[in-house]
């Protein structure tokens, strides 16, 4: 029994709803009474949602899942996952049993955009070329972990003396703090770019020291 799911991961923003697509091809004369559908977490086999004995057996996953009952008879076994959380990320298996078996796994990739970075200087006054300054770039509430890039006013990457830390909060979202220690040149513009690798979203800010 061939069960089809998308090859690419399903990308869902935190807090939105996601559809994990799954389909099978019913034989002529198929009725829902013959169907046993099980959605489960691939790694642990924890039950997520099921359909059996001709009826929806309900969500076993924090009551945030639903099937598409009107589409099941046509072979649409997709699962709706509501209010996506970071903890939902992973692989879900769609298992279909009608006389014979079929299954396929679909990956859910969770994402959250990073906020526009805020920048702080230390020290923040009486600065001259040749002084060493610490610039902190902070961006919040993103997922997954960010990539951070620094550059000067000419667009030249600054890679030395950069320390980046990322801390997850209780929701699993990351706050990013990147510190650049630099000796001030004549051109005092410094840019920080925070990239979400899944969303291909760039959040950036710059500071000009005069």
């Amino acid at each position: 029994l061939e069960v089809q799911v998308p090859e690419d991961p399903v990308v869902a923003l935190v807090g939105t709803d996601a559809t994990l697509c799954c389909s099978f091809s019913p034989e002529p004369g198929f009725s829902l009474a013959q169907l046993n559908l099980i959605w489960q977490l691939t790694d642990t086999k924890q039950l997520v949602h099921s359909f059996a004995e001709g009826q929806d057996q309900g969500s076993a996953y924090a009551n945030r899942t639903a099937l598409f009952p009107d589409l099941l008879a046509q072979g649409n076994a997709s699962l709706r996952l509501q209010r996506v959380r970071v903890a939902d990320e992973g692989s879900f298996t769609c298992f279909v049993s009608i006389r014979d078996f079929g299954s396929a796994a679909v990956s859910l990739q969770v994402a959250a955009p990073y906020s526009k970075p805020s920048m702080t200087l230390e020290p923040n006054k009486d600065l001259r070329p040749g002084d060493t300054v610490t610039i902190t770039c902070s961006s919040y509430q993103g997922y997954p972990e960010a990539e951070v890039f620094w550059q000067d006013g000419q667009g030249v990457p600054l890679t030395g003396n950069v320390t980046t830390s990322q801390m997850a909060n209780e929701q699993g979202l990351f706050d990013v703090h990147s510190i650049l220690r630099v000796v001030l040149g004549a051109n005092g513009t410094y840019s920080c770019l925070v990239r979400n690798p899944v969303l291909q979203q760039d959040a950036h800010s710059s500071v000009t020291i005069t």
Epitope: L1, E2, V3, Q4, S25, Q34, L35, N36, I38, K45, L47, S50, A52, E53, S97, I98, R99, D100, F101, G102, S103, A104
Partner: antibody, heavy 114, light 107 residues
């Protein structure tokens, strides 16, 4: 009409090898997981191996007792499934059935004896 | 591994009698239970799948029920041709496992 026909059974000495074949007709072979199951008076019905679909990357699963000795394979163009059995033991003796979970062949007898 | 237990190894019933055969799983198998009939010298034949769906061509006197870990198959009015061994099998997880079988004979 669905038909599954096994072949390749027979008498083999312990440590020997044997390859079973099963040709299927009457359903779209490429869409079905295929299995080998064996039966003996001592152990009853015992699942041996399974091979899934191309879309499952032809994933295979084996009973612990045959892991490393038996290999299941399929040829969708020939609607056939195979079981290569190496290093056979007396306890591998039995009737070997190929099935798609729902539909079964008539079986082929494998006897491992000195 | 999931263990399937058919507690009754053999039983005899009169023609017309109702027969119930049970199968207990060692863990929840979420309805992925099939029942097979095997007559002497023949290969197993599917009777019931997904715990309660009757295979095409199987007489309506056969029925299946159950959920979780407890399943049963009922023959509403035993017929001489029902003399056979009946096996349950779970398809929830590999290794797939079978019950030990229940041999049903005519009294």
């Amino acid at each position: 009409e669905v038909q599954l026909e096994e072949s390749g059974g027979g008498l083999v000495q312990p440590g020997g090898s044997m390859k079973l074949s099963c040709v299927v007709s009457g359903f779209t072979f490429r869409n079905y997981w295929m299995n080998w199951v064996r039966q003996s008076p001592e152990k009853g019905l015992e699942w041996v191996a399974e091979i899934r679909l191309k879309s499952n990357n032809y994933a295979t699963h084996y009973a612990e007792s045959v892991k490393g000795r038996f290999t299941i394979s399929r040829d969708d163009s020939k609607s056939s499934v195979y079981l290569q059995m190496n290093n056979l033991r007396a306890e591998d003796t039995g009737i070997y059935y190929c099935n798609s979970h729902a539909d079964w062949g008539q079986g082929t007898l494998v006897s491992v004896s000195a | 591994d999931i263990v399937l237990t058919q507690t009754t190894a053999s039983l005899a019933a009169s023609v017309g009698e109702t027969v119930t055969i049970t199968c207990r799983a060692s863990e929840n198998i979420y309805y992925t239970l099939a029942w097979y009939q095997q007559k002497q010298g023949k290969s197993p034949q599917l009777l019931i799948y997904n715990a309660n769906s009757l295979e095409d061509g199987v007489p309506s006197r056969f029925s299946g029920s159950g959920s979780g870990t407890q399943y049963s198959m009922k023959i509403n009015s035993m017929q001489p041709e029902d003399t056979a061994t009946y096996f349950c099998k779970q398809g929830y997880d590999v290794p797939y496992t079978f019950g030990g079988g229940t041999k049903l004979e005519i009294k």
